[in-house]
């Protein structure tokens, strides 16, 4: 039977598909060999001869079994706000990820297209949700009894210290100042450490509304055209060439 032919190219039986690592060439009407990762189709199959594969040139790659006429170009070098986490080889594209203190504002299939610096919460604001590789820091105003006196992408609101005698009451951006020599920390929303409270609480003031973030700049990476599909089931080419496997 035609489908029992062991070697490509062969005509598939009615209603059957080509085997693994083969593709259907629409012009030849045959199942033909795909090229392995790191290679591309130099010459396409015909009824009489199989696909001829060739290695990808420098700075190009194919990651999947394929029959693309040209290897895909590796992405441009990583920008200054990025680190290269995977080098460009014949079998894989370069992958750039954001360096510490930055997050990916616009991702691509692998790695990041656009990195932006993590938001820094201003004094009076603390980190409500930390930044991740793909999401920015979320800031929130420090609740009564807590403060943050830093501009930081990591610091949370901390509880005011509890004074036996308050010299200066704390507010959202400043800790309380005690005259006593042994201050303690209050139990307050957003506190990390929860020591036993003493009976008196410090006074607090609400922060006045203000922008919660320090100005930041973001850097757009160079954006090239999307590479052609690779490793899909469609037939990428339609010309006949003479070749051997």
């Amino acid at each position: 039977l035609p489908a029992q032919v062991a070697f490509t190219p062969y005509a598939p039986e009615p209603g059957s598909t080509c085997r693994l690592r083969e593709y259907y060439d629409q012009t030849a009407q045959m199942c033909c060999s795909k090229c392995s990762p790191g290679q591309h189709a130099k010459v396409f199959c015909t009824k009489t001869s199989d696909t001829v594969c060739d290695s990808c040139e420098d700075s190009t790659y194919t990651q999947l079994w394929n029959w693309v006429p040209e290897c895909l170009s590796c992405g441009s070098r990583c920008s200054s706000d990025q680190v290269e986490t995977q080098a460009c080889t014949r079998e894989q594209n370069r992958i750039c990820t954001c360096r510490p203190g930055w997050y990916c504002a616009l991702s691509k299939q692998e790695g990041c297209r656009l990195c932006a610096p993590l938001r820094k919460c201003r004094p009076g604001f603390g980190v409500a949700r930390p930044g991740t590789e793909t999401s920015d820091v979320v800031c929130k105003p420090c609740a009564p009894g807590t403060f943050s006196n830093t501009t930081s992408s990591t610091d949370i609101c901390r509880p005011h210290q509890i004074c036996n005698v308050v010299a200066i009451p704390g507010n959202a951006s400043m800790d309380a100042v005690c005259t006593s020599t042994s201050p303690t920390r209050s139990m307050a929303p957003g506190a990390v450490h929860l020591p036993q409270p003493v009976s008196t609480r410090s006074q607090h003031t609400q922060p006045t509304p203000e922008p919660s973030t320090a100005p930041s700049t973001s850097f757009l990476l160079p954006m090239g055209p999307s590479p052609p599909a690779e490793g899909s089931t469609g037939d990428h080419h339609h010309h006949h060439h003479h070749h051997h496997h």
Partner: antibody, heavy 116, light 111 residues
Framework: QIQLVQSGPELKKPGETVKISCKTS????????MNWVKQAPGKGLKWMGW????????TYADDFKGRFVFSLETSDSTAYLQINNLKSEDMATYFC?????????WGQGTLVTVSA | DIVLTQSPASLAVSLGQRATISCTAS??????????MNWYQQKPGQPPKLLIY???NQESGIPVRFSGSGSGTDFTLNIHPVEEEDAATYYC?????????FGAGTKLELK
């Protein structure tokens, strides 16, 4: 299951244009080319040509160059046959056929009647 | 183009008897040990239905009474025993090279 469903019969006057659709389902449209076959009333089968469903490149048999146009709507997995400036000799049933050496998948056919 | 000559143009066969249809190609339709010759059955108002592919391979769901043989340029379709539902027109088709071509058809009638 694999299906090729063609548009309904058409009654046209000489000089007019007709466009027949062939909507496919049950397989990946862009893997297989699409053949078009003509059958005049009481006559045999004649291959008109084919269209590459990935690149969109058409190939026309010698007798079907000029007034015949193959096209695609890939997003809808549909192939089209358009005949311009209809003539009486275009009166026939037209079939879309999935392009394989052993062609087992045919549309049901579209009858085009050309009458003044 | 490869020309396919089918014979006879029509034949009448009694129920239960054998029907034999021949198809001769103007050049070989073989390649790599495979004969790219197919046989179709067509009934009025319907598209052709694949019966035999690669000269002798039966398409799935086709009754065993349909068989094909031949290679190179000479091919035969046999129907035995003929049943009532077999009344139809039969076409040979070569798919070895473009353009794919069809025979003129053989009309099978029951006596």
């Amino acid at each position: 299951q694999i299906q090729l469903v063609q548009s309904g019969p058409e009654l046209k006057k000489p000089g007019e244009t007709v466009k027949i659709s062939c909507k496919t389902s049950g397989y990946t449209f862009t893997i297989y080319g699409m053949n078009w076959v003509k059958q005049a009333p009481g006559k045999g089968l004649k291959w008109m040509g084919w269209i590459h469903t990935y690149t969109g490149e058409p190939t026309y048999a010698d007798d079907f160059k000029g007034r015949f146009v193959f096209s695609l709507e890939t997003s809808d997995s549909t192939a089209y046959l358009q005949i311009n400036n209809l003539k009486s000799e275009d009166m026939a049933t037209y079939f879309c056929v999935r392009r394989e050496r052993y062609g087992s998948f045919w549309g049901q056919g579209t009858l085009v009647t050309v009458s003044a | 183009d490869i020309v396919l000559t089918q014979s006879p143009a029509s034949l009448a066969v009694s129920l239960g008897q054998r029907a034999t249809i021949s198809c001769t190609a103007s050049q070989s339709v073989d390649y790599g040990g495979v004969s790219y010759m197919n046989w179709y059955q067509q009934k009025p108002g319907q598209p052709p239905k694949l019966l035999i592919y690669g000269a002798s391979n039966q398409e799935s769901g086709i009754p065993v009474r349909f068989s094909g043989s031949g290679s190179g340029t000479d091919f035969t379709l046999n129907i035995h025993p003929v049943e009532e539902e077999d009344a139809a027109t039969y076409y040979c088709q070569q798919s070895n090279e473009d353009p794919p071509t069809f025979g003129a058809g053989t009309k099978l009638e029951l006596k």
